[in-house]
């Protein structure tokens, strides 16, 4: 006769592990008892259970509540064992000696792989901001057992780094991803994909990546001179620009307070019917917590009756 | 045959000391187990000491322990119970009895044992 | 320790009796379990073994079952060379156990 088992048999942390141990023997031959042990290199065997064809099963009281016959119905041949909810711990060397009848003593060796699923954590760089130069946008790191592998999946460019660090049972990776914030990387997701032959699928960690700019400030309302005439109703300015974080405005006049009437809605500046009052110098203040911008125009209100033609300058200022 | 011939018994002070032996013929007395039962008067059975088939490695009940020493001459085929600082509650009549090892510490019920030995501790 | 609790402590019975005497395990113990046979003055004579192996050259008029924390000893047809006390033993753990036992005399 000879013994059937695996070389090795792997299990997911917490999940139970059978041990295989079948007894293929001649017609007549019985099996009296089987002994599982651990073996690990250098230490003496530990008992693990017996298996007796007639005191049933022993469990040795280190693995009291964990060590079970798989379920009847049961070949007589059968010396496979259960192990419960398999720890890290458990990874090793086991041996299974069965002493059968008129054959004699036969044993076998396995390995038990205790694979340990990785828990992954990302965790964002410093904040980004336009402008600066390469700069870590998102760190990720997964401890598992054997080593987790850690990827990125993003439409954006960047480099990545990996370094590994060895724990006696385990291993944790961390992975960087490296970036040159622009603008047109605001919203982006980053993703962070990990993985492990003990999971079923990867784990995904999505970061939205926040990169602060403010754009060039810019008026408008002012593209069609003529319209801007004494008795003229509606007229109004806009200010125009972009940022992350959104930005607030300010409107002033550079040569005096703001004229009564005049209405300051966020970025809109709102004109009663126009007047020569309302000719001046208008400032359009733009910031977030990233930056600010002005942009200044010169409004110059027409009056009809007068051949001089209207003069308009636009001036940009940062 | 099977015999188990203990032997060492009999009347000593509290806080003496006294060895028991078993003698063993008929089997191959290395492989196996052996301990020691003891039986007060008038009462139930109490094991008291085990002994593997051929290491050292011994066994004690937590009312002997430090007190008495379970040993074999596997060469002799005999098997010795050396009881110290005896008390009043160790009289009982001591048997030997023999156990097949299946595995590990695991062993069969007692299958054969002795006829037993007296012992008494009485001032 | 593992206790083990026999019933009843006595019981009296005729010959051609059928006697049941119960053993209980404070814990699983698979089938490590031993039916003994004491008559006075006597060393104990194993009768069961494996909670329900007869042991060599012991009537069949004695059987033993059960497993796990249950066993029972049972004399089909008392004799009158059977009136003895018995006792349990668990061997799955050190120190094995006996049970108090169980004194069957005659009715």
């Known amino acids: 006769g000879e013994l059937e088992t695996s070389d090795v048999v792997t299990v997911v942390l917490g999940q139970d592990a059978k041990l295989p141990c079948f007894y293929r023997g001649d017609s007549g031959e019985q099996v009296g008892q089987v002994a599982w042990a651990r073996v690990d290199a250098g230490e003496g065997a530990q008992e693990l259970a017996l298996l007796h064809s007639k005191y049933g099963l022993h469990v040795s009281p280190a693995y009291e509540g964990r060590v079970e016959q798989p379920p009847p119905p049961r070949n007589p041949l059968d010396g496979s064992v259960l192990l419960r909810n398999a720890v890290q711990a458990d990874e090793g060397e086991y041996e299974c000696r069965v002493s059968t009848f008129p054959a004699g003593s036969f044993q076998a060796r396995l390995r038990l792989r205790v694979l340990v699923p990785p828990l992954p954590s990302l965790n964002p760089g410093p904040a980004l901001e336009e402008g600066q130069g390469l700069t870590l946008a998102a760190s990720c790191t997964a401890e598992g057992s054997p080593a987790p592998s850690v990827t990125w999946d993003t439409e954006v460019k960047g480099t990545t780094s990996s370094r590994s660090f060895k724990h006696s049972r385990s291993a944790a990776v961390t992975s960087e991803f490296h970036l040159v914030p622009s603008r047109s990387m605001n919203g982006q997701p980053l993703t962070c994909v990990v993985s492990h032959p003990g999971l079923l699928q990867d784990q995904r960690i999505t970061h939205i990546l926040h990169v602060s700019f403010l754009a060039e400030a810019s008026v408008r309302g002012l593209e069609d001179q003529n319209l801007w005439h004494i008795g003229r109703e509606g007229a109004m300015l806009k200010c125009l620009s972009e940022g992350q974080p959104p930005p607030s405005y300010n409107w002033t006049r550079l040569d005096g307070p703001l004229p009564s009437g005049v209405r300051v809605d966020g970025d809109t500046l709102g004109f009663p019917p126009l007047t020569t009052e309302h000719s001046g110098i208008y400032v359009c203040h733009v910031s977030n917590e990233f930056s600010s911008r002005d942009s200044q125009v010169t409004v110059d209100v027409l009056d009809p009756q007068e051949d001089s033609g209207k003069q308009v300058d636009l001036v940009s200022a940062s | 045959e099977v015999q188990l011939v203990e032997s060492g018994g009999g009347l000593v002070q509290p806080g003496g000391s006294l060895r028991l032996s078993c003698a063993a013929s008929?089997?191959?007395?290395?492989?196996?187990?052996m301990s020691w039962v003891r039986q007060a008067p008038g009462k139930g059975l109490e094991w008291v000491s085990g002994i593997k088939p051929s290491t050292s490695t011994t066994y004690y009940a937590d009312s002997v322990k430090g007190r008495f020493t379970i040993s074999r001459d596997n060469s002799k085929n005999t098997l010795y119970l050396q009881m110290n600082s005896l008390r009043a509650e160790d009289t009982a009549v001591y048997y030997c009895?023999?156990?097949?090892?299946?595995?590990?510490?695991?062993?069969?019920?007692?299958?054969?044992w002795g006829q037993g030995t007296l012992v008494t501790v009485s001032s | 320790d593992i206790q083990m609790t026999q019933s009843p402590s006595s019981l009296s019975a005729s010959v051609g009796d059928r006697v049941t005497i119960t053993c209980r395990a404070s814990?699983?113990?698979?089938?490590?379990l031993a039916w003994y046979q004491q008559k006075p003055g006597k060393a104990p004579k194993l009768l069961i073994y494996a909670a329900s192996s007869l042991q060599s050259g012991v009537p069949s008029r004695f059987s033993g079952s059960g497993s796990g924390t249950d066993f029972t000893l049972t004399i089909s047809s008392l004799q009158p060379e059977d009136f003895a006390t018995y006792y349990c033993q668990q061997h799955y753990t050190t120190p094995p156990t006996f049970g108090q036992g169980t004194k069957v005399e005659i009715k």
């Open positions: 814990q699983g113990i698979s089938s490590y």
């Open positions: 009895a023999r156990a097949e090892l299946l595995a590990f510490d695991v062993y069969t019920a007692s299958d054969y």
């Open positions: 008929g089997f191959s007395f290395g492989s196996y187990g």
